[in-house]
C-alpha cells in the first residue's frame, strides 16, 4: 500500500511540476503536507533555474549532478540521495518525509552511522570479553594477547605459552621454570645462568667482596672466615666479623712485687750475679706460691760452674740437689707446699750444713763437709738463676727434673742483700709480674696453644685407636678451639670447639671432622664461675658424648663417612693441640679462634701437664688460673 502511494505521488509530481511548472500551492497538493512541501519547493526552484529553457549554460550544467530537469526534480524528495549515511557504518538508508533513517552495521552508531562503538569500553561486556588486550577498530574490535601468551580458538581467551614444554632445551643444563607470559632459567643457589653457554656457572661471591675478612669460594657457594687468632669470630650474618667478647671476666690484676716464675716456657726468668766478701755464705729467703708439683725455684752456681745448688719442687715438696768438690747430694723433705698458699721458704748455708725452713720451721738439714762455693781472690762470686738453669746443667743433675714451674715468689732476700735492684728490673717488665689471686687449673689467655705428642693407637683394642677425652672447662670467652688433632697435611681431622650460641648467654660445643660439624651440643651455660665437665670417646666406629646435661651415642647418616676420614688420619700421624690451632688454613675448621679460659685435659686416662708439652705459648699458665673478677661496691 505504501509503495502504491509513493507511485501516485511520483506521477502527480511528473504531471504538475515537470511537464508543467508548479507554484508552491500546487506542490502542496502533490505532497499533501507542509514539511515535504517546504523541503521540496526551494530545491525545485534551484532545478528550474538550472534547466529552464534560456537559462541553461554549459557552466551551470557542469556544476549540476543531474543531466536534465526530470532527474533533478525527481531526486528532491528522496532523502537518501545523495547518501547522507556514513558509507562505512551504514547498512541501509530509509527515505522519510523530509528526513531519512540510517540503519547502522554492528559496531556503528549515530544518526548517520558516523560514530564507531568502542566495544572495549562497553560496561555490559567488560574489555569486550577479551581476557587480555581489547583492540577497538572502526566498526569492530578484536582481542589480542600479551607476549608469551597465545589466543584460544574462541578468539577471546589468552593462554600462557609454556616455553619449557615447548622447547625443552631452552635452558640448556639449567632448570626451566615457566612463569605467566615468560620463563626463567633457574640455577641452584650459588650459580648464575649464562645465556651464551645455556648453563649454570658458579658465582664467585668472593670477587663481590661478600666477606669482611677472608672468603673461600667453592662450587655453588662461599664461606666467610674471620681471623680467630686475632680475636675475631664470624657474626650471625655469616659475613661480617666481630670481636670474640668476654663472657666471664677474670681478675687479671698483677703486682710487680710478685715475680712470676713461668714467664718463659723454656728458659730462666731472672739471672743475678753476686760478688761478695769471701766470708759470705749462700742464703735465700722468699715467699713462694704455686699449685705446680714439680719445677725449679732457683739454681745457684759458682763462677766456674764447679759447684752448684738447686732448690726445686718435686711431688709438691722442697727438693735440694747440691754438688761441689766435696760432695754430691739430693734431699727432699717437708710438707707439700703446692697448695696455692704463700709459704715462707728459707735456704741458709751454715758452717757444716744447709738448713731449709718452711714458715721458719726447719724441714731439712743437709750436712756439708766444707763451704758450698769456694771463694777466689778474696771474693765469693755466685750466679743465681730463678725458675731454671743453664742448658748444660741438665745432664749434670743428680736426678733429672722438669724445670718448668708455674709459681710466684715475693719478699725475696738473696745472699742477705735484700731485694734492692731486682724490683726495679721487674717493675718495667709486665710479663714478669704475677697475678694477685690464682686458682688451681691451667689458663689459656686466648693468644696461643700448647702441643703434645700423644700416641692414640691401642694395640689391645679391635678399634685400633681411640681418643677418650675429659675436659674440665671454665671459659672466659664463648668462642675458641679447646682441643684439635692436626695432620701433617695441615688438615684438622678432629676438633672440639666452643662457639657462642644463637640463644643469648649460652654456648654450643662443636665436634668437627675437618671443616664439617659432626655434632653440636646446643645452648649450654658454660660461662659461669663453676667448672663444666665434658667427656667424649671416639674411635673409628663410634662417637660418645657426655655433658652436664646428657650422655649420648651420636649416630647420623653422615657420621660413618666422617669417622672414616678421621680413621684415615689417625692411622697416619696426628699432633695434639690444646687451646687453639697451629698455622692451618682458615677453612680447615669451623672455628679457628684461640680458647680463652681455664681448662684441664685428660686424654686416654692421662692428665695432661702443660709443663710436659712439646711446645707451649709463654702466656699459657700451666698450673694457675686467674680468679673470676668479682664486682666490688665501688668498682
Amino acid at each position: 500500500a505504501n509503495s502504491l502511494l509513493e507511485e501516485t505521488k511520483q506521477g502527480n509530481l511528473e504531471r504538475e511540476c515537470i511537464e508543467e511548472l508548479c507554484n508552491k500551492e500546487e506542490a502542496r497538493e502533490v505532497f499533501e503536507n507542509d514539511p515535504e512541501t517546504d523541503y521540496f519547493y526551494p530545491k525545485y526552484l534551484v532545478c528550474l533555474r538550472s534547466f529552464q529553457t534560456g537559462l541553461f549554460t554549459a557552466a551551470r550544467q557542469s556544476t549540476n549532478a543531474y543531466p536534465d530537469l526530470r532527474s533533478c526534480v525527481n531526486a528532491i524528495p528522496d532523502q537518501c540521495s545523495p547518501l547522507p549515511c556514513n558509507e562505512d557504518g551504514y547498512m541501509s538508508c530509509k527515505d522519510g518525509k523530509a528526513s531519512f533513517t540510517c540503519t547502522c552495521k554492528p559496531g556503528w552508531q549515530g544518526e548517520k552511522c558516523e560514530f564507531d562503538i568502542n566495544e572495549c569500553k562497553d560496561p555490559s561486556n567488560i574489555n569486550g570479553g577479551c581476557s587480555q588486550i581489547c583492540d577497538n577498530t572502526p566498526g569492530s574490535y578484536h582481542c589480542s594477547c600479551k607476549n608469551g601468551f597465545v589466543m584460544l580458538s574462541n578468539k577471546k581467551d589468552c593462554k600462557d605459552v609454556d616455553e619449557c614444554s615447548l622447547k625443552p632445551s631452552i635452558c640448556g643444563t639449567a632448570v626451566c621454570k615457566n612463569i605467566p607470559g615468560d620463563f626463567e632459567c633457574e640455577c641452584p643457589e650459588g650459580y648464575r645462568y649464562n645465556l651464551k653457554s645455556k648453563s649454570c656457572e658458579d658465582i664467585d661471591e668472593c670477587s663481590e667482596n661478600m666477606c669482611a675478612q677472608l672468603c673461600v669460594n667453592y662450587p655453588g657457594g662461599y664461606t666467610c672466615y674471620c681471623d680467630g687468632k686475632k680475636g675475631f669470630k664470624l657474626a650471625q650474618d655469616q659475613k661480617s666479623c666481630e670481636v670474640v667478647s668476654v663472657c666471664l671476666p677474670l681478675n687479671l690484676d698483677t703486682k710487680y712485687e710478685l715475680l712470676y716464675l713461668a714467664e718463659q716456657f723454656a728458659g730462666v726468668v731472672l739471672y743475678l750475679k753476686f760478688r761478695l766478701p769471701e766470708i759470705s755464705r749462700f742464703s735465700a729467703e722468699f715467699d713462694f706460691r704455686t699449685y705446680d708439683s714439680e719445677g725449679v725455684i732457683l739454681y745457684a752456681e759458682s763462677i766456674d760452674h764447679s759447684a752448684w745448688l738447686l732448690i726445686a719442687l718435686r711431688g709438691g715438696k722442697i727438693e735440694v740437689q747440691l754438688k761441689n768438690e766435696h760432695t754430691s747430694k739430693i734431699t727432699t723433705g717437708g710438707d707439700v707446699i703446692n697448695n696455692g698458699l704463700w709459704n715462707m721458704v728459707s735456704v741458709e748455708e751454715l758452717e757444716h750444713s744447709i738448713s731449709i725452713k718452711i714458715a721458719k720451721e726447719a724441714v731439712m738439714d743437709i750436712n756439708k763437709p766444707g763451704p758450698l762455693f769456694k771463694p777466689e781472690n778474696g771474693l765469693l762470686e755466685t750466679k743465681v738463676y730463678f725458675a731454671g738453669f743453664p742448658r748444660k746443667v741438665e745432664s749434670e743433675l743428680i736426678k733429672p727434673i722438669n724445670p718448668r714451674l708455674d709459681g710466684c715468689i715475693r719478699s725475696w732476700n738473696l745472699m742477705k742483700q735484700g731485694a734492692s735492684g731486682i724490683k726495679e728490673i721487674i717493675q718495667e717488665k709486665q710479663n714478669k709480674h704475677c697475678l694477685v689471686t690464682v686458682e688451681k687449673g691451667s689458663y689459656y689467655p686466648g693468644s696461643g696453644i700448647a702441643q703434645f705428642h700423644i700416641d692414640y693407637n691401642n694395640v689391645s683394642s679391635a678399634e685400633g685407636w681411640h681418643v677418650n677425652v675429659t675436659l674440665n672447662i671454665r671459659p672466659s670467652t664463648g668462642t675458641g678451639v679447646m682441643l684439635a688433632l692436626v695432620s701433617g697435611n695441615n688438615t684438622v681431622p678432629f676438633a672440639v670447639s666452643l662457639v657462642d650460641s644463637t640463644s643469648e648467654k649460652s654456648q654450643d660445643i662443636l665436634l668437627s671432622v675437618e671443616n664439617t660439624v659432626i655434632y653440636r651440643i646446643q645452648a649450654l651455660s658454660l660461662c659461669s664461675d663453676q667448672q663444666s665437665h665434658l667427656e667424649f670417646r671416639v674411635n673409628r666406629n663410634n662417637l660418645e658424648l657426655s655433658t652436664p646435661l646428657k650422655i649420648e651415642t651420636i649416630s647420623h647418616e653422615d657420621l660413618q663417612r666422617q669417622l672414616a676420614v678421621l680413621d684415615k688420619a689417625m692411622k697416619a700421624k696426628v699432633a695434639t693441640y690444646l687451646g687453639g690451632l697451629p698455622d692451618v688454613p682458615f677453612s680447615a675448621t669451623p672455628v679457628n679462634a684461640f680458647y680463652n679460659g681455664c681448662m684441664e685435659v685428660n686424654i686416654n686416662g692421662v692428665q695432661l701437664d702443660l709443663d710436659e708439652a712439646i711446645s707451649k705459648h709463654n702466656d699459657i699458665r700451666a698450673h694457675s688460673c686467674p680468679s673470676v673478677w668479682k664486682k666490688t661496691k665501688n668498682s
Partner: antibody
C-alpha cells in the same frame, strides 16, 4: 568460526587397519597443532597422537599404547589431519576426537567419529 | 608417566550447594586444565592454566591448586552444571587425563 569434522570411523576386525580424517576450517590451519584424543567407557579420555605445525617441523608424538601402530599426518593445503591406524586391537575401540591444540591444552574438539574393533 | 586421580568419581548436589572436586597428581606439575562434557557432546575446555575460566563459563566456577593437588569448585550448583568434568595435564611430551568426576543434580 572454528569447525572440526571427523570421518572414517566404523567397524573393523582386530589386526585390521583404518584411516580417520579431520577436516578443519575457521582458523589458520598451517599454524595449528592438531591432536587425536579418544574416549571409551573403560579408559575414559585418552590422548592418542599429536602433530605440530610447520614451524615445529611437523613433529609427531604418540601415546605409548599406540606407538608403532598409529601414524598421524597432515595436509596443510587441504586443512586436513589424518590418523592411520594399523594392527588394531579391541582396546582401540572408542570415539576418536580431532582437536585443535593450543599451548598444551585441547582448545576445540570435533564431534567425534566412532571406531569399533571387533570380530 | 604422570597419573591423574579424580575424586569423587560421582557426586550429586542440590541447587545452590557448593561443590568441590579434586585432581591428585602422581608428581608435581605446573598447570592443570579442566574440561566439561555433557552426554552426547564433545568435551569443552572449561578452565585453563589452573584457575582461568574460558570466556562464557559462569563465574560460579573456579579452579585452584599447585604441585600435586588441584581442585575445581562450584560456588552454587545449578541444573545446567550437571556434567562430567575432566582434569588434564601435559608433561614430557605426554598428555594425561583424569578419570573424570560425574556431577549430578539432586
Amino acid at each position: 568460526e572454528v569447525k572440526l569434522e571427523e570421518s572414517g570411523g566404523g567397524l573393523v576386525q582386530p589386526g585390521g587397519s583404518m584411516k580417520l580424517s579431520c577436516a578443519a576450517s575457521g582458523f589458520t590451519f598451517s599454524d595449528a597443532w592438531m591432536d587425536w584424543v579418544r574416549q571409551s567407557p573403560e579408559k575414559g579420555l585418552e590422548w592418542v597422537a599429536e602433530i605440530r605445525s610447520k614451524a615445529n617441523n611437523h613433529a609427531t608424538y604418540y601415546a605409548e599404547s599406540v606407538k608403532g601402530r598409529f601414524t598421524i599426518s597432515r595436509d596443510d593445503s587441504k586443512s586436513g589431519v589424518y590418523l592411520q591406524m594399523n594392527s588394531l586391537r579391541p582396546e582401540d575401540t572408542g570415539i576418536y576426537y580431532c582437536t585443535l591444540t593450543t599451548a598444551f591444552l585441547f582448545d576445540y574438539w570435533g564431534q567425534g567419529t566412532t571406531l569399533t574393533v571387533s570380530s | 608417566q604422570i597419573a591423574l586421580t579424580q575424586s569423587p568419581a560421582i557426586m550429586s548436589a542440590s541447587p545452590g550447594e557448593k561443590v568441590t572436586m579434586t585432581c591428585s597428581v602422581s608428581s608435581s606439575v605446573s598447570y592443570m586444565h579442566w574440561y566439561q562434557q555433557k552426554p552426547g557432546s564433545s568435551p569443552r575446555l572449561w578452565i585453563y592454566d589452573t584457575s582461568n575460566l574460558v570466556s562464557g563459563v559462569p563465574g560460579r566456577f573456579s579452579g585452584s591448586g599447585s604441585g600435586t593437588s588441584y581442585s575445581l569448585t562450584l560456588s552454587s550448583m545449578e541444573a545446567e552444571d550437571a556434567a562430567t568434568y575432566y582434569c588434564q595435564q601435559y608433561s614430557g611430551y605426554l598428555y594425561t587425563f583424569g578419570g573424570g568426576t560425574k556431577l549430578e543434580i539432586k
